[in-house]
Structure formats: structure tokens, C-alpha cells
């Protein structure tokens, strides 16, 4: 007979990413004996919750909790029974709930209460439902990307920790209601709100991060729609031949469009709006989202927000990825340079509704909006974050790394479960996010 080594025991963790437009559940797993290695935690499975984000249930909070049941039932199947009790379960809500909290703290509390009630009914080790700050969202996305790409440490053949310090990757996240940019920088921040110091695997990281509320994909589209409605005739970013009835209440209920709300309007009224496929006017419409004229610091991105020059390589994920992937795969256009991205955007924006539909078999609900989002992404990167051709060459658009979705969820779990030690093994334990 021969000794057969048993496979190492696996541990599991679950994170519910409660975004503004929808909720996703991620189940992670890792070998119990390698908890402190970098890149060892990976995605076991995922599930997209049907329906809107939890903030969309503000008027019926119990449905927010109910909406999660289908995915939680899947988690029961994905995680071995004997691991249920030791599997941490977290729910993190992002900008959709931050916006709801601005307008209705009571409704926000009720929604969180409802999801908590649902989550506590499951046999997992539920550790709370909370709203992440924009800074959390940015930093945890950065941690996720660099952890998965093993940029923090390497395990050497001599059994010692070898730190390559090969440089970290900046992270850009485009959600439904906010967008985040996070990158390691050598220059001290002129605004303490944008600086985070991390100690990971014995290394110190000075990280710049900022989250722009109301600059997520869906809120940008609502703001552009509100601008078009102010003029009441057409939408230059929508394709010619496309028209729809716009319910005014839906446009103006967001805090992001409050400034564009008419003094008096019939909240139940609908307005017919048509597209004109006018790339030039769409560019001007989008440029109105960025105030680059005033900066109280030595350098800014936009809206008076401090930002040092972008440095190093970046990964752009979530809606950045989906939009650029559309330009590449559906439109068949190159996007390797800023100039090409501008070209691809212009080409997309000049397409008629019939031309766009011909490229996409079957009705695609988001089809009319790709022009506006692509235009926004181009301007956000070039005018907003000030990427030039040289720095843009270091940007990759991806949704996954090492077969795991890139987003804040993994970094959030790694932090809360102390899976990233602040110091090298044998020295000190415990993650320090200061």
C-alpha cells in the first residue's frame, strides 16, 4: 500500500456585492493551509440576483431581502454542508445605497434591516450588511486586482517570503452610480481624503483613491437624459431612428439629477425623446459633466478633486470592460490608443438605430446607450484623469484576473477575514488598513 496525501481542506467565504443596478454574489475558496499566500483565494462560483439593486426596493424593503434568496439557495449548494458554519458571509452595498442614504436615511436603514433579516436565516457565519464608503470601494478593488495578479508577494523556493516589489496595478472601476480610481503613488496627497496607507505582507503602500458619486454608468446616463430633456427635443447620443417615452419621475428622482430638475414638473408625465446620432453634440453634452476650470490644489482631475499624475499600469473593469468590449467585439473597432478609442466612439455615435441593431442579433436593452457611455469613458480618461497616449498604453480592460471577477468584493473579504497579513509570517499577524 501507498500513503495517499489527502487534498488540503478548503475554506469558503461569501460576499454579496449590492450594487446600484443589481446584486451579485461571489463564493470564494482557498486551501486552509495556505491562507497567507497571495493569489491563493479564488472564485468558486457566482450568482447574479434577479431584479434591481437593493436600493430600488426603498418603497418595499422586505422585497430587498427576498430578492437575495435565489442566490443564497445556490450558495447552500456551492458550499459543502460541513463548511456552512465556518463560512463568513458579508453584504456590502455601494453607491446606490449611498445615494439613497442622502435622500432617505430611514428607507436605507429599513433596506439594510430587511437584507440582514434574510441573511441571518441562513446557516453561514453572517458578519453584517453595511454600506461601503467610496474610499473603501476604490481601495478594495485595488487590493483585489493586485492580490489576484500576485503583485504583493511571492513564495520563494527556500521557504522564505520573497517580495518582488514589481509594482502594483492601478484600478479603475465604473459602477452604476459611481466610479473609482485608485493607484499607488510616491507623491504625498494634498487632500487627506484621497490618501490611504496600507501595510500588506510587510510592505508599505501609499495609495491615492477617489470615488466620484453620480459618475457611474447609469447615473451619467440619467444626467445626460436630464440635460437633453431641458431642451425637450432630441438626444444627440442616442441613435437616429430610436425614440422612447421618458417618464420624468424616473429621471428626476435621483440626487444626481436634482440640479437639473425643473422647478415644477408633472411627475407622472412622459416626454418623447428621439436620437440624432450626432457625435459632435454628444461630445459637448458629455463634456458638461466635467468641470476642469477650477482647482484648489496644485493639480486636479476634475470638479476640483486633487489627483497626482496617473502612474504605472492600470486595470479598468466592470462597465469600463463591458463598454470597451462592445466597441471591440460588436463594432469590430481597435481601441489600443486614446485616438483609436476616440475614433471607435465617434463611429459608434454616428450609427443609426437600424445599423446598430443589425450588428446585434436580438434586441439588446443597452444598445442605445453605448455611444454615450463610450464618450463618457473617453472623456473621463483623457480629460478627467488626464491619461495621455503613453499612460493609456498601460491600461488593460478586463473583467477577470485568475478566473476571478475583479471588483471590490474579494478585497473586502480578504480584509475582513484577515487573509492578508500586515507583516511577514513569523513576525506579526493582523491586517492593518489605516
Amino acid at each position: 500500500t501507498q500513503d495517499v496525501r489527502e487534498p488540503p481542506a478548503l475554506k469558503y467565504g461569501i460576499v454579496l456585492d449590492a450594487g446600484s443596478s443589481h446584486t451579485s454574489m461571489f463564493v470564494y475558496k482557498w486551501p486552509a493551509d495556505k491562507e497567507n499566500d497571495t493569489g491563493i483565494v479564488g472564485q468558486h462560483s457566482s450568482c447574479d440576483v434577479r431584479g434591481g439593486g437593493i436600493s430600488s426596493y426603498a418603497n418595499d424593503p422586505s422585497r430587498a431581502g427576498q430578492s437575495l434568496v435565489e442566490c443564497l439557495e445556490q450558495a447552500l449548494r456551492d458550499v459543502p454542508k460541513d463548511r456552512y458554519a465556518s463560512t463568513p458571509l458579508y453584504l456590502g452595498a455601494t453607491a446606490g445605497m449611498r445615494l439613497l442614504n442622502l435622500t432617505s436615511p430611514e428607507a436605507t436603514a429599513k433596506v439594510l434591516e430587511a437584507v440582514t433579516q434574510t441573511l441571518t436565516r441562513y446557516p453561514f457565519d453572517f458578519r453584517g450588511a453595511r454600506i461601503l464608503s467610496g474610499q473603501d470601494e476604490g481601495v478594495f478593488g485595488w487590493v483585489t486586482a493586485n492580490y489576484l495578479l500576485e503583485n504583493f508577494i511571492k513564495y520563494g523556493w527556500v521557504g522564505r517570503w520573497i517580495r518582488p516589489r514589481k509594482g502594483t496595478l492601478g484600478a479603475m472601476d465604473l459602477g452604476g452610480a459611481s466610479t473609482q480610481i485608485t493607484f499607488e503613488t510616491t507623491s504625498p496627497s494634498e487632500d487627506p481624503d484621497n490618501e490611504v496607507h496600507l501595510r500588506l505582507y510587510g510592505q508599505h503602500y501609499r495609495v491615492y483613491t477617489h470615488s466620484f458619486l453620480c459618475y457611474g454608468r447609469d447615473q451619467v446616463l440619467q444626467r445626460l437624459l436630464a440635460s437633453a430633456l431641458q431642451i425637450h427635443r432630441f438626444h444627440p447620443c442616442w441613435p437616429k431612428g430610436y425614440s422612447t417615452q421618458v417618464l420624468l419621475r424616473e429621471v428626476y428622482q435621483s440626487p444626481c439629477t436634482m440640479g437639473q430638475r425643473p422647478q415644477t414638473f408633472n411627475s407622472s408625465a412622459t416626454v418623447s425623446l428621439s436620437g440624432t446620432s450626432n457625435a459632435a453634440l454628444c461630445r459637448d453634452l458629455v463634456s458638461g459633466l466635467f468641470n476642469i476650470s477650477s482647482c484648489p490644489f496644485s493639480q486636479c482631475s476634475f470638479n476640483g478633486v486633487f489627483q497626482p499624475p496617473v502612474a504605472g499600469n492600470f486595470i479598468a473593469f466592470s462597465a469600463f470592460y463591458y463598454t470597451v468590449d462592445f466597441l471591440k467585439t460588436v463594432m469590430g473597432l481597435p481601441v489600443g490608443t486614446l485616438k483609436q478609442l476616440e475614433d471607435a466612439t465617434e463611429t459608434t455615435c454616428n450609427q443609426t438605430w437600424a445599423e446598430l441593431q443589425a450588428r446585434v442579433p436580438g434586441q439588446q436593452t443597452r444598445l442605445p446607450d453605448y455611444c454615450a457611455v463610450a464618450m463618457f469613458i473617453h472623456q473621463l480618461l483623457s480629460r478627467g484623469y488626464r491619461f495621455d497616449e503613453r499612460s493609456f498604453r498601460g491600461v488593460v480592460f478586463e473583467k477577470k484576473a485568475a478566473d476571478t471577477a475583479v471588483g471590490w468584493a474579494l478585497g473586502y473579504m480578504l480584509n475582513l477575514t484577515n487573509l492578508i497579513p500586515a507583516d511577514l509570517p513569523g513576525l506579526r499577524k493582523g491586517t492593518h488598513f489605516s
Epitope: S227, I231, R233, P236, T276, N278, A279, A280, L281, R283, D284, L285, S287, G288, I292, T337, L338, K339, E342, E346, Q379, S382, R383, R386, D388, E389, R390
Partner: antibody
Framework: QVQLVQSGAEVKKPGSSVKVSCKAS????????VSWVRQAPGQGLEWMGR????????QYAQKFQGRVTITADESTSTAYMELSSLRSEDTAVYYC?????????????WDQGTLVTVSS | SYELTQPLSVSVALGQTARITCSGD??????VYWYQQKPGQAPVLVIY???NRPSGIPERFSGSNSGNTATLTISRAQAGDEADYYC???????????FGGGTKLTVLG
């Protein structure tokens, strides 16, 4: 075919203001932006600013910020450029130009210009 | 602020090729436009997006743009090509147009 027609030549005193008009015809005024460009005698072209009539958005060259105001009246398809605190160096031909949606926002239609002379 | 630099003048023999340059920091990253202006007339767009000709502009006019230099090339130069030529670019960062100082093209012979 879009055509632009500007107001006539002006002679102004230093310190005063001038308002030049630019009327568009033969196209939809709300489907493009209008820029103002000036050219002093024997000198090159100098961009002053632009307006997107449909949105009311304006952008100005740093050099003219605070001294130039560009407006538009959609009902008459007319753009206006007002320059205040005139000095002799402002003597120039002032052009309005359409930013073409077809040629990536470059200026494809110009008027013959308005000569503004600033002299005491 | 962003600046575009052009030679004051360029001369070319009738029927030969004229090249007018326009230099600016990393101008290859931006789109460049060329305008022709004859005495007493308004400028006319001859090249857009670095190397595209509007309808009605002869094929003899072409453009290129890379690195720090954009070039307008006029092949088989004719007497009627004698004019001032201006390059221009849109500075997206500052949301403004920038013109070069202009080049006077003289066709000899």
C-alpha cells in the same frame, strides 16, 4: 447647404465694446457648435471661443476669458460675440465658423468675416 | 498651454512637392486639421483628422501626423496653391482650439 452671414464692419473707440452677429441659414442651427476666430492685420488665426447653441455651453480661450461673451438665439439661428474693453490690438477681422459634425468638429463653413477697427 | 509651431514660409517649384510642418508636444496623439487661406478670403478646410480630405479638395493634398510633427503635403504644386496654411488641433484637456502661426507657401516659376 449651411451658410453663415455676419454683421457689417465696425469702428470702435478704445474701452468700448463691440457685438458681432452671425446668422446661420440652410441647416439646423441646433445640430452643431459655432466658434469665433479672429485675425489681426498680417497676423495668424486666433481662436476666441465657442458656443453649442442647443446646450448653451460656452468655452473661451484663456486669453479672452472675462472679456468675451458668446451667446446664441436659437429662434433666429444667430450667434453673437461681444468683446469688451477694446484696445487697438483688437483691430482684426472676426470670423464665425461652424464646427462640422461630419469632419470631427473642424471648421467647414466660414463667413467672410467682420472687420472691427479700434481707433481713437 | 499647448502651442503649435509652423515655419513662417515654404517655397516650392511649380509641379514639385511642398511639405509644411506643424510641431507640437506629442501632436501625434491629437487630430490635426489644415486650413488654406488666400488673401482677402476666409480660411478653407483642406485636411481633417490628420489625413482626410473634405469633398472638393484635390487628391494632391495629403496629411500625416506622428510623434511631435504633423505634415501637410501638396504634390504637383500649382500656382493656385499659393496661400497661407494653418494647422489646428483641439486640446481636449482645456476644451479649446489651438492654431499654428501659419506658413506662407510660395510657388516658384
Amino acid at each position: 447647404q449651411v451658410q453663415l452671414v455676419q454683421s457689417g464692419a465696425e469702428v470702435k473707440k478704445p474701452g468700448s465694446s463691440v457685438k458681432v452677429s452671425c446668422k446661420a441659414s440652410g441647416g439646423t442651427f441646433d445640430s452643431y457648435a459655432v466658434s469665433w476666430v479672429r485675425q489681426a492685420p498680417g497676423q495668424g488665426l486666433e481662436w476666441m471661443g465657442r458656443i453649442v447653441p442647443w446646450l448653451g455651453h460656452t468655452q473661451y480661450a484663456q486669453k479672452f476669458q472675462g472679456r468675451v461673451t458668446i451667446t446664441a438665439d436659437e429662434s433666429t439661428s444667430t450667434a453673437y460675440m461681444e468683446l469688451s474693453s477694446l484696445r487697438s490690438e483688437d483691430t482684426a477681422v472676426y470670423y464665425c465658423a461652424r464646427e462640422s459634425p461630419g469632419y470631427r468638429y473642424s471648421f467647414d463653413v466660414w463667413d467672410q468675416g467682420t472687420l472691427v477697427t479700434v481707433s481713437s | 498651454s499647448y502651442e503649435l509651431t509652423q515655419p513662417l514660409s515654404v517655397s516650392v517649384a511649380l509641379g514639385q512637392t511642398a511639405r509644411i510642418t506643424c510641431s507640437g508636444d506629442a501632436i501625434g496623439e491629437k487630430y490635426v486639421y489644415w486650413y488654406q487661406q488666400k488673401p482677402g478670403q476666409a480660411p478653407v478646410l483642406v485636411i481633417y483628422d490628420d489625413n482626410n480630405r473634405p469633398s472638393g479638395i484635390p487628391e494632391r493634398f495629403s496629411g500625416s501626423n506622428s510623434g511631435n510633427t504633423a505634415t501637410l503635403t501638396i504634390s504637383r504644386a500649382q500656382a493656385g496653391d499659393e496661400a497661407d496654411y494653418y494647422c489646428a488641433s483641439y486640446d481636449l484637456q482645456q476644451a479649446r482650439w489651438v492654431f499654428g502661426g501659419g506658413t506662407k507657401l510660395t510657388v516658384l516659376g
